[in-house]
């Protein structure tokens, strides 16, 4: 019953960009201005989205589908589909409650958008800092003191074993 | 209908005042955050100041301690009282509901003025 049913629904033949129009014995009717409908057989159009304020048009909504929004220039999106709209900041800041704000010493964000985050720890891998870090970049770890020891190849051969605390001859 | 007017633009000397309005209608303004942004000539939308529904303000670095932002819940208006003007403050400043109220952050409910120019110049 309901697979006929299905096929005596007048709405069914309705394509996107229409409706069935219930206030005319269900003749299919173009989507209003300012609407659409993505899939057939739809009984109502929905509203298009408005890009306004921070939100600028990326695509022009039509009888088939929705507009799509990005941002102004300055700003990113957030969120599916661009639901929101965050400030940028400069390499080397991070959005705070007063606005953009640099990082502090030992900090980085080499983007415009984002937190600043801590600087690598070198000595956590036995490395030393090649490069120093500044508000924009991390830190270059390089390798470790022992490998730029007087002397040392380039190819390090496996270290004896040694207890702890003696340092190599 | 949703509607944001903003008001109080003008051309002022460096050193000035101004204060800009922004008349609501259309939604429960006592209980939504407003903000204020600008954009100068040339360059991008900037987040100038925020204020939640209790009173609570927060201000760009740029702007603080020159500028006050205020709401009237029984008028539904919007302030931003600007004291010490400088060149640099020469843009087109907007209201804008704030559901987000995440600084420097709008969401795509939100509903934005039309904007009201502020040109700071001796």
């Known amino acids: 019953f309901e697979r006929t049913r299905s096929l005596q629904d007048p709405c069914s033949n309705c394509p996107a960009g229409t409706f069935c129009d219930n206030n005319r014995n269900q003749i299919c009717s173009p989507c209003p201005p300012n609407s659409f409908s993505s899939a057939g057989g739809q009984r109502t159009c929905d509203i298009c989205r408005q890009c306004k304020g921070v939100f600028r048009t990326r695509k022009e909504c039509s009888s088939t589908s929705n507009a799509e929004c990005d941002c102004t220039p300055g700003f990113h999106c957030l969120g599916a589909g661009c639901s929101m709209c965050e400030q940028d900041c400069k390499q080397g800041q991070e959005l705070t409650k007063k606005g953009c704000k640099d990082c502090c010493f030992g900090t980085f964000n080499d983007q415009k958008r984002g937190i600043c985050r801590p600087w690598t720890n070198c000595s956590l891998d036995g490395k030393s800092v090649l490069v120093n870090g500044t508000k924009e970049r991390d830190v270059v770890c390089g390798p470790s003191p022992a490998d730029l020891s007087p002397g040392a190849s380039s190819v390090t051969p496996p270290a004896p074993a040694r207890e702890p605390g003696h340092s190599p001859q | 209908e949703v509607q944001l007017l903003e008001s109080g633009g003008g051309l002022v000397q460096p050193g000035g005042s101004l204060r800009l309005s922004c008349a609501a209608s259309?939604?429960?303004?006592?209980?939504?955050?407003m903000s204020w942004a600008r954009q100068a000539p040339g360059k991008e939308l900037e987040w100038v100041s925020s204020?939640?529904?209790?009173?609570?303000?927060y201000y760009v670095e740029s702007v603080k301690g020159r500028f006050t932002i205020s709401r009237d819940n029984a008028k539904n208006t919007l302030y931003l009282q600007m004291s010490s003007l400088r060149a640099e403050d020469t843009a087109v400043y907007y209201c804008?509901?704030?559901?987000?109220?995440?600084?420097?952050?709008?969401?795509?409910?939100?509903?934005w003025g039309q904007g009201t120019l502020v040109t700071v110049s001796s």
């Open positions: 204020i939640y529904s209790s009173g609570k303000t």
């Open positions: 804008a509901t704030w559901k987000t109220l995440r600084v420097g952050v709008w969401d795509e409910s939100d509903y």
């Open positions: 259309g939604f429960t303004f006592s209980s939504s955050a």
